[in-house]
Amino acid sequence: GPVPPSTALRELIEELVNITQNQKAPLCNGSMVWSINLTAGMYCAALESLINVSGCSAIEKTQRMLSGFCPHKVSAGQFSSLHVRDTKIEVAHFITKLLSYTKQLFRHGQQFN
């Protein structure tokens, strides 16, 4: 599948920062999502996890961006082996982990899809 260019990764990082900066109230009313393995293929896995959160405007742009990074169509209820299916975490924690790892990839120039 297509590898996200560095500009697209920068935009994703910026959006993840936008929705977490100085944020103490639970994102998406404290919704829980499946944790994922932060490895190659993580963008599709992240989308598969976050797409199950509906009615949360704060993450809609992130969902759209991840759709652009994922080569196949993802729909609610769809799961890949990249999910750690025994662990659910809050959306805010999920976003923070995703941000941290995306920055790591960006710094090292490894734009994994």
Epitope: R10, I13, E14, V17, N18, T20, Q21, N22, Q23, K24, A25, L99, K103, F106, R107
Partner: antibody, heavy 126, light 109 residues
Amino acid sequence: EVQLVESGGGLVKPGGSLRLSCAASGFTFSNAWMSWVRQAPGKGLEWVGRIRSEIDGGTTNYAAPVKGRFTISRDDSKNTLYLQMNSLRTEDTAVYYCATDQVGAYYGDYYGMDVWGQGTTVTVSS
Amino acid sequence: SYELTQPPSVSVSPGQTARITCSGDALPEKYAYWYQQKSGQAPVLVIYEDSKRPSGIPERFSGSSSGTMATLTISGAQVEDEADYYCHSTDSSGNHGVFGGGTKLTVLG
């Protein structure tokens, strides 16, 4: 030693321009979000604006009174923050501080740490 | 534009508890930060993210937040705590910072 040192302040006429610099040392400047804060004589602290680290987008935000007149920039290769001030007004007279931005501390490696410069005085008067 | 409201002054006797409040509409969802500024000096962070204390700040300084109000508490105030205190936070977007008007703490010696 962790420190910020401002320079560039001085006396300028209304409508004039000035560029302040803030030299950082002792911490990873490139990872830090940085802010400018000012304090008019005998008044309280006023947030001027901030710049995110490059990795976090490098975007800038400004307070309404300075938006369109002031520009914050950074040069990570020189560990230096800048504040370009144009169309200066008498009400811009203040001590200007540069500081690590606490909102950005969450994303940098200075979480729970606080660094401010000693301040540089800007006087706008005819 | 977004504002944070603080009382202009608070007075306590040495050893008493001083409480300084800060109110703002976005505080239920955004963290508050507290700075101490002594005359002629740069501000010093005493509380971050509502209630966390930076290293080197005495334990008598604590912070809390409930609803639209953040509170800085100095338990057993000392003469050296006399200073101006400012709360700092952001608007609901998180993009724009704001300081409260400041509170002058007087510790009656």
